[in-house]
């Protein structure tokens, strides 16, 4: 009888074991284990009747198609074999064991005790057949195995071979190299590669196989395994295989498909080809006069580009448009995309206007072309070129006027300061005790009119100031302080300020320049109690044009000492000029007390100690600080007065030969202006030079050298 066994292990014993087995007995055990396993069989006890070639009693081990072993007896002889320590391994997952005893046994034989077990097959080691083994990597596990591929490869659906994904290769460059995957290593199996060369219409692709060409072939059948096919439109070239590369191929097309097929076997190195685009030839080119063509070639083909440029100082001119370079291209029909342009000399055109300056041409016919030269100069004597620049500009190759120092920036004409168009007389008669000023004597003098229209009725007052630049007026803070405040210092609104420059007679403002204020800046520390830091600035809405009657005064150097005692200074103003009119009379009578014509007076600086003493001796809280100085005469008779406030006290600087503002009319009193031993008190401007430059947004070095020279 037959016993079917399906367990992974088990025990088989002869009938009746451990007693002797019966005669004339036959049992077959069929052992089946899962795929991926084989069966290992061994005997722990074996005692059968001996016979020549095991003819009588035996144990036969076999598979479906082969006998693995036949055992009998109790020990091995030449003609009979016992299992002993031998292990029987089935090649597959099936093993059949047959026990047979004949009709007579001379002795008692105890039979056998056998054990079997399923053991794993290491397919990775044992498979030598290329058709079954893994292409790249093999991984064994209990009961089976699987294959995997190297990086960049994909396992084929046969779960054994490794292919590549190579069906999406697009080449658009005009030249290139295409190879089989992994070249020059053997190409992958089971792959379908597609390479597309897609160039612009007008190009023709030429192919050339290079180096190694090694594609699996067959001695009789043309390329049945692996091959290359080249598809040009509807036409197919190939298949190609073997070791001899095809001849160079001129496709006459801009679009080419290369198909490469490999089957699941073989070890061949593959192929490499280069492709090159060919196009129509364009006619020879001649460079323009004063120009060149790049790149310079003997021949030009479709898609070749040339850049036309001109010599230094010339510009490419195409259709009346100037440009630095011009590019033309060889078209697919073998013509150039454009005619060669011409080279035209660079023209810097009319130079920019210089504010407060003039232009003179150094080149004949007022030429403005490359290398022409011009010279800027300032409107002297009212303006001077900053940093003593030469003012010479040359027409550059870029088409801009260039100066060696300033580049393309225009020079700056700075107002000259402290140089009246009319020289001030050295002797001045005894705006109290003063005399009429001739027009142009004090070109920095400004009349500041403040009209506060925010109050009903309007508040209106005036003061003086000094022009520092085309845009800035220096004055006293108390002139520009809101008058309705008791102790707080608030500047008047800029809208309420009007500045008159070049004014001589207040009755005739027609010749004067009037300007509104863009900013009103009081010194942040101005003290209404003692008039300390009585200094302010007005920025004009627009810069004023300078001329004989409008010119700035110079600022002093930073000198804490201020002007030296007994130095003579001049001060001008439209204030009270009649020493016999008292303040009370002005108030009560309403008499017009402004002087029509600008008055000026020459006054000596009073030693600080003397001035302090003269004010300390009075009743009242008078304080002459280090930010003030005094001027006037002990005997009186000449002084500044009400309405002159903010005006410049100027001293002639011998070093620079210019007039410098050393003081601003600030305060005096309590007696009438011009009284005996009542000195006028002036803001010491030299203490505020840094503050002034800072507010004006100018570095001191810009203007300072004018005073120093």
């Amino acid at each position: 009888h037959t016993v079917e066994l399906n367990n992974m292990f088990g025990q088989i014993q002869s009938p009746g074991y451990p007693d002797s087995y019966p005669s004339d007995s036959e049992v077959t055990w069929n052992i089946t284990v899962p795929d991926g396993f084989r069966i290992k069989l061994y005997f722990m006890h074996f005692n059968l009747e001996s016979s020549y070639l095991c003819e009588y009693d035996y144990v036969k081990v076999e598979t479906e198609d082969q006998v693995l072993a036949t055992f009998c007896g109790r020990e091995t002889t030449d003609t009979e074999q016992t299992p002993g320590q031998e292990v029987v391994l089935s090649p597959g997952s099936f093993m059949s064991i047959t026990f047979r005893s004949d009709f007579s046994n001379e002795e008692r034989f105890t039979g056998f005790d056998a054990h079997y077990m399923a053991v794993d097959v290491d397919e990775c080691k044992e498979r030598e057949d290329e058709e079954l083994s893994c292409d790249h990597y093999c991984h064994n596990y209990i009961g089976g195995y699987y294959c995997s591929c190297r990086f960049g490869y994909i396992l084929h659906t046969d779960n054994r071979t490794c292919r590549v994904e190579c069906s999406d290769n697009l080449f658009t460059q005009r030249t290139g190299v295409i190879t089989s995957p992994d070249f020059p290593n053997p190409y992958p199996k089971s792959s379908e590669c597609l390479y597309t060369i897609e160039l612009e219409e007008g190009f023709m692709v030429n192919l050339q196989f290079e180096d190694i060409f090694d594609i699996e072939d067959h001695p009789e059948v043309p390329c049945p395994y692996d091959y290359i096919k080249i598809k040009v439109g509807p036409k197919v070239l190939g298949p190609f295989c073997g070791e001899k590369a095809p001849e160079p191929i001129s496709t006459q097309s801009h679009s080419v498909l290369i198909l490469f097929h490999s089957d699941n076997s073989g070890e061949n190195r593959g192929w490499r080809l280069s492709y090159r685009a060919a196009g129509n030839e364009c006619p020879e080119l001649q460079p323009p006069v004063h120009g060149k063509i790049e790149p310079s070639q003997a021949k030009y083909f479709f898609k070749d580009q040339v850049l036309v440029s001109c010599d230094t100082g010339y510009k490419v001119l195409k259709d009346n448009v100037e440009m630095d370079t011009f590019q033309i291209e060889c078209l697919k029909d073998g013509t150039w995309s454009n005619k060669i342009p011409t080279c035209k000399i660079v023209d810097c055109r009319a130079p920019g206007e210089l504010e407060h300056g003039l232009i003179t041409f150094s080149t004949r016919n007022n030429l403005t072309t490359y290398k022409s030269e011009i010279k800027y100069s300032c409107q002297e004597p009212y303006y001077k070129m900053l940093n003593n620049n030469t003012g010479i500009y040359t027409c550059s190759a870029q088409g801009v006027w260039m100066n060696k120092v300033l580049g393309r920036s225009l020079p700056t004409c700075l107002p000259e300061c402290g140089q009246p168009s009319r020289s001030l007389p050295s002797l001045v008669k005894r705006i109290i005790g003063g005399r009429n000023a001739e027009p142009g004597l004090f070109p920095w003098q400004a009349l500041i009119v403040v009209e506060d229209t925010s109050r009903v009725p309007n508040d209106k007052w005036f003061g003086s100031g000094a022009l520092l630049s085309a845009s800035w007026i220096l004055t006293a803070a108390h002139v520009l302080r809101s008058q309705r405040r008791d102790t707080t210092v608030i500047p008047v609104s800029k809208e309420h300020v009007t500045v008159y420059l070049g004014l001589h007679d207040v009755r005739d403002k027609s010749g004067a320049v009037n300007s509104s204020a863009a900013r009103v800046v009081l010194h942040p520390d101005f003290n209404i109690q003692n008039y300390n830091h009585d200094i302010a600035l007005v920025q004009l809405q627009e810069p004023v044009p300078l001329g004989p009657h409008v010119m700035p005064v110079c600022l002093p150097r930073l000198e804490p000492e201020g002007p030296a005692p007994h130095m003579l200074g001049l001060v001008a103003g439209w204030g009270i000029s009649n020493p016999n009119v008292t303040v009370d009379e002005i108030i009560s009578s309403g008499t017009r007390t402004l002087s029509d014509v600008l008055q000026y007076v020459k006054l000596p600086v009073v030693p600080h100690a003397e001035c302090k003493t003269s004010y300390e001796s009075r009743s009242g809280n008078y304080s002459v600080t280090e930010n003030m100085f005094c001027a006037g005469y002990y005997e009186g008779g000449k002084d500044t007065c009400l309405g002159d406030s903010g005006g410049a006290f100027v001293i002639f600087d011998d070093l620079s030969q210019r007039w410098v503002v050393q003081g601003l009319v600030s305060w005096g009193g309590p007696e009438e202006c011009g009284s005996k031993q009542v000195y006028g008190v002036y803001t010491k401007v030299s203490n505020y030079v840094d503050w002034v430059w800072e507010q004006m947004g100018l570095p001191q070095s810009v203007v300072e050298p004018q005073v120093e020279r």
Partner: antibody, heavy 113, light 112 residues
């Protein structure tokens, strides 16, 4: 015609706030100061402060700094005074004045529980 | 703050009489820059808003009868009504215009 038109009388409870308006017409509202003046029955005039509508600049009498707030709406030519934390002492007639010369008709405020 | 003291606090006169009232300031109200005294006089008739009569101590507001005259400078100021009319019955206030502005206590004018 140049005039200042004030909002009507107000009766409010102590602790509340009130906003009095003053609409200007006939002149450039932004360019002139608007003053506010308090008058209690049988008392004199007290200057509360002022606002320049164009710039929003304000000046306050120290006594009213925590009581009154001035604002101005230039699109409607209207000045406002808000009074907060009202007490019976705030009961009065409040005038708006165009920089001394032109007075509004006054707004009477009564603070009572 | 500047304090203004008005006197008398009230007075009664017959129509046609001349009236003088004063206003004293605790500080000088003359501004040397504008050459103005920042003092104004106002008239408040019963049940009405105050009305500007005089500004800058002595300048009469347009439309104000010339019987009203302001004078003075510095700290002492006077309002004079040369010939009182019945319609002049009112309280008269002085006001100084340095911030913070302040008013005097008022002078009440009654007609006999």
């Amino acid at each position: 015609e140049v005039q200042l038109q004030q909002s009507g009388a107000e009766l409010v409870k102590p602790g509340a706030s009130v906003k009095i308006s003053c609409k200007a017409s006939g002149y450039t509202f932004t360019g002139k100061w608007i003053e506010w003046v308090k008058q209690r029955p049988g008392h004199g005039l007290e200057w509360i402060g002022e606002i320049l509508p164009g710039s929003g600049s304000t000046d306050y009498n120290e006594r009213f700094k925590d009581k009154a707030t001035f604002t101005a709406d230039t699109s409607s030519n209207t000045a406002y005074m808000q009074l907060t934390s009202l007490t019976p002492d705030d009961s009065a007639t409040y005038y708006c004045v165009r920089s001394e010369d032109l007075w509004g008709s006054g707004t009477t405020l009564t603070v009572s529980s | 703050d500047i304090v203004l003291t008005q006197s008398p606090s009230s007075l009664a006169v017959s129509a046609g009489e001349k009236v003088t009232m004063t206003c004293k300031s605790s500080q000088n109200l003359f501004n040397s820059r504008t050459r103005k005294n920042y003092l104004a006089w106002f008239q408040q008739k019963p049940g009405q808003s105050p009305k500007l009569l005089i500004y800058w101590a002595s300048t009469r507001e347009s439309g104000v009868p010339d019987r009203f005259t302001g004078s003075g400078s510095g700290t002492d100021f006077t309002l004079t009504i040369s010939s009182v009319q019945a319609e002049d019955l009112a309280v008269y206030y002085c006001k100084q215009s340095y911030i913070p502005f302040t008013f005097g206590g008022g002078t009440k004018l009654e007609i006999k």
